[in-house]
């Protein structure tokens, strides 16, 4: 008997051939011997069975001896032995019918669990096998799950159904709803204008929901909310901001926000959560501000950095276009009595520059100039 | 009082075109699927396509297959074969058909002479 799988909701096409190659009569049957379908003269004849409507035949091959069953919109219980009677011929084909589906939504929140499940039809005993779009496999019976999904997890899930040495792929999109960035940095000098950027993994057609950042600075003892706000349809909306500092938000997507200055007071973490309709759970994102001062009191130049930075940076005090004077893994260095000329404060990773600041010291008989 | 009514038949030189239409009443046509047969000259009646009731799914004997479009428009219960191309050999009385039976529905057919 020949086997046939099938997918639930997907069009499935039974062979039946005869020797003659001509358009003769034929009759397909299930296994309770109720007629489906057949042809009598130049019409497609169907009988009184479930499929009724979901039944069909194509007449283009009927004149070359073949005479297919085709289902429309499989349904798990269309699994059965299909008989097709031709030529005083009886042909069998088993067809067997699966349906995989996502537990609940196929959009889930980063670090939520995925559930797979698997409806067979009785008697069945397969075996399924997925892929995730980053190449893990996972395998199990009638149900699989993935917990802790990451933004890798994103995208097309192939899972492959075995049954009878055959095989039926279905492929799964699953969308895992995160910040692209679960971390970021941002390094400015003092007084400057701070950009911060919370861009989306996903793009999805109605985003709402409301949002939060909370602060919590170097110098205080405690966080504090700087902004919250609405997203309706992709449009922000500003519900309620702190008079210091006076932040300033995007209207549209990607969230954005501005920091009219940078300043020592302002340097810290910050937690911005993301709350979307209809979903349990919040999407954060993590948010670091580094500030640099650089300044001369009286005779000694002073470079100072605040915020979180790792303990393997290096604040440098040089003078330009010579070695540092001063280099150290701390967030202050200085220089006492500094020879006139340009001098640079730099933080630096590993050799690479991550803020800059310069101040003039003027001969001693002046003020100093901080360009 | 169900009624099939073909029209769009006629003289044409081969390489031409020409459209059928058949005409449906009597029944609910949008729940049909349909076909279109011909019957050559001294010869036996032959299917030539199917559509289904949506008008999604259609089907054509393979040698008119590219060269004949079926289609049908259900707010018009209109029921239409496009044929391009046409050679001597589709000269015949075109005919009209529920695909299946039950109903069985024809139409009377419509004459299609292909000649120079």
């Known amino acids: 008997k020949k086997v046939v799988l099938g997918k639930k909701g997907d069009t499935v096409e039974l062979t039946c051939t005869a020797s003659q190659k001509k358009s003769i009569q034929f009759h397909w049957k299930n296994s309770n011997q109720i007629k489906i379908l057949g042809n009598q003269g130049s019409f497609l004849t169907k009988g009184p069975s479930k499929l009724n409507d979901r039944a069909d035949s194509r007449r283009s091959l009927w004149d070359q001896g073949n005479f297919p069953l085709i289902i429309k919109n499989l349904k798990i219980e269309d699994s059965d032995t299909y008989i097709c009677e031709v030529e005083d011929q009886k042909e069998e084909v088993q067809l067997l019918v699966f349906g995989l589906t996502a537990n609940s939504d196929t959009h889930l929140l980063q670090g939520q669990s995925l559930t797979l499940t698997l409806e067979s039809p009785p008697g069945s005993s397969p075996s399924v096998q997925c892929r995730s779009p980053r190449g893990k496999n996972i395998q199990g019976g009638k149900t699989l799950s993935v917990s802790q999904l990451e933004l890798q997890d994103s995208g097309t899930w192939t899972c492959t159904v075995l049954q009878n040495q055959k095989k039926v792929e279905f492929k799964i999109d699953i969308v895992v709803l995160a910040f692209q960035k679960a971390s970021s940095i941002v390094y400015k000098k003092e007084g400057e204008q701070v950009e911060f950027s919370f861009p989306l993994a996903f793009t999805v057609e109605k985003l709402t929901g409301s949002g939060e950042l909370w602060w919590q600075a170097e110098r205080a003892s405690s966080s504090k909310s700087w902004i919250t706000f609405d997203l309706k349809n992709k449009e922000v909306s500003v519900k309620r901001v702190t008079q210091d500092p006076k932040l300033q938000m995007g209207k549209k997507l990607p969230l954005h926000l501005t920091l009219p200055q940078a300043l020592p007071q302002y340097a810290g973490s910050g937690n911005l959560t993301l709350a979307l309709e209809a979903k349990t759970g919040k999407l954060h994102q993590e948010v670091n501000l580094v500030v640099m001062r650089a300044t001369q009191l009286q005779k000694n130049l002073t470079c100072e950095v605040w915020g979180p930075t790792s303990p393997k940076l290096m604040l440098s005090l040089k003078l330009e276009n010579k070695e540092a004077k001063v280099s150290k893994r701390e967030k202050a260095v200085w220089v006492l009595n500094p020879e006139a000329g340009m001098w640079q404060c730099l933080l630096s990773d590993s050799g690479q520059v991550l803020l800059e600041s310069n101040i003039k010291v003027l001969p001693t008989w002046s003020t100093p100039v901080q360009p | 009082e169900v009624q099939l009514v073909e029209s769009g038949g006629g003289l044409v030189q081969p390489g031409g075109s020409l459209r059928l239409s058949c005409a449906a009443s009597?029944?609910?046509?949008?729940?049909?699927?349909m076909s279109w047969h011909r019957e050559p000259p001294g010869r036996g009646r032959e299917w030539l396509a199917d559509?289904?009731?949506?008008?999604?799914?259609?089907d054509y004997l393979a040698s008119v297959r590219g060269r004949f479009t079926i289609s049908r428009d259900n707010a018009r219960n209109t029921l239409y074969l496009q044929m391009d191309s046409l050679r001597s050999e589709d000269t015949g009385v075109y005919y009209c058909?529920?695909?299946?039976?039950?109903?069985?529905?024809w139409g009377q057919g419509t004459q299609v002479t292909v000649s120079s």
């Open positions: 058909a529920s695909r299946e039976d039950p109903p069985g529905y």
């Open positions: 009597g029944f609910t046509f949008s729940r049909l699927a």
């Open positions: 559509i289904d009731s949506s008008g999604d799914t259609t």
